[in-house]
């Protein structure tokens, strides 16, 4: 079975200093697959913020970059700029 | 073993139609992540990006060259085919067809020979 | 569509020598760039995709790295086959543009 592992639950981070999320697939070669990122904030809203290439939800493009790591088998996704509104559970998914 | 090969005319008159084929063996164009590209490169220069095709049957094509090309697929007989209308003597290229893959972001893993195209009257 | 700038176009060096190629984007690709090694009369031959990643096979004195609009290729010693002409390829947007290449001669 195929499982993406985020490396750390908790991540903390300092306002305006870039954070990088990562996430490890088990099981399979990530080569295979399409990276995708959501956020979930409070009120438990789903957000998509970005899916492989090049293609960013409304208002993520300026400061998020989703990017991977094949021969580690991580996706990673980088908040270039972190502020308070950037604060919840962010999810890694895949599809083909 | 993977291979691709590119056949069709040497020479070409102006304004004619150029059609090209790429018989492929090694791989299926039915496999997702999957496709064909075209690249021709003039005698002495670089590579240029030409057009691709996809195990879904999305087509690409370059924005420069996109109303003179055509590409298409045949997965019954592992070929694609590429049409370009009104030839000129600028393109006179070696042409390649290359196996695009997804697992390495569409980078072109296999080509073919190449087949040296020469547009003259 | 995007445009890449490799530099030098020509470069002399000597077997066992370290060289670097590099290669830039008119904007930003993350690290969706391959590189390719092309020999006169053959096709080019893929070294490097995702910035970094080393296609099965090739050799490890090939390295690449970068992100964003610049990215290096480097050669760690070089050897006699590997005089030839190396280019890079944007893969994030279509079409997926080459550079005009490198020539690598024997000094």
């Known amino acids: 079975a195929i499982e993406l592992v985020p490396e750390h639950q908790t991540v903390p981070v300092s306002i305006g200093v870039p954070a990088t999320l990562r996430c490890s697939m088990k099981g399979e070669a990530i080569g295979n697959y399409y990276i995708n990122w959501y956020r979930k904030t409070q009120g438990n809203t789903m957000t998509f913020i970005y899916r492989e290439k090049d293609i960013y939800g409304p208002g993520f493009k300026d400061n998020f970059q989703g990017d991977i790591d094949i021969a580690k088998n991580l996706a990673v996704l980088k908040i270039l700029a972190p502020s308070e509104r950037d604060e919840g559970s962010y999810y890694c998914a895949c599809d083909t | 073993q993977v291979t691709l090969k590119e056949s069709g005319p040497t020479l070409v008159k102006p304004t004619q139609t150029l059609t090209l084929t790429c018989t492929f063996s090694?791989?299926?164009?039915?496999?997702?992540?999957?496709?064909v590209g075209w690249i021709r490169q003039p005698p002495g220069k670089a590579l240029e990006w030409l057009a691709l095709?996809?195990?879904?049957?999305?087509?690409i094509y370059s924005p420069s060259l996109k109303s003179r090309l055509t590409i298409t697929k045949d997965t019954s007989k592992n070929q694609v085919v590429l049409t370009m209308t009104n030839m000129d003597p600028v393109d006179t290229a070696a042409y390649f067809c290359?196996?695009?893959?997804?697992?390495?972001?569409?980078?072109?893993?296999?080509w073919g020979q190449g087949t040296m195209v020469t547009v003259s009257s | 569509e995007i445009v890449m700038t490799q530099s030098p176009s020509f470069l002399s060096a000597s077997v066992g020598d370290r060289v670097t190629f590099t290669c830039r984007a008119s904007?930003?690709?993350?690290?969706?760039l391959a590189w390719y090694q092309q020999k006169p009369g053959r096709a080019p031959n893929l070294l490097i995709y995702?910035?970094?990643t080393l296609q099965s096979g090739v050799p490890s004195r090939f390295s690449g790295s970068g992100s964003g609009t610049e990215f290096t290729l480097t050669i760690s010693s070089l050897l006699p086959e590997d005089f030839a002409t190396y280019y890079c390829q944007q893969l994030i947007s279509y079409p997926y543009t080459f550079s005009q290449g490198t020539r690598l001669e024997i000094k």
């Open positions: 095709i996809l195990w879904n049957d999305h087509t």
């Open positions: 290359a196996r695009d893959k997804w697992e390495l972001r569409d980078a072109f893993d296999i």
């Open positions: 090694g791989f299926s164009l039915t496999t997702s992540g999957v496709g």
């Open positions: 904007q930003g690709i993350s690290r969706y």
């Open positions: 995702v910035a970094s």
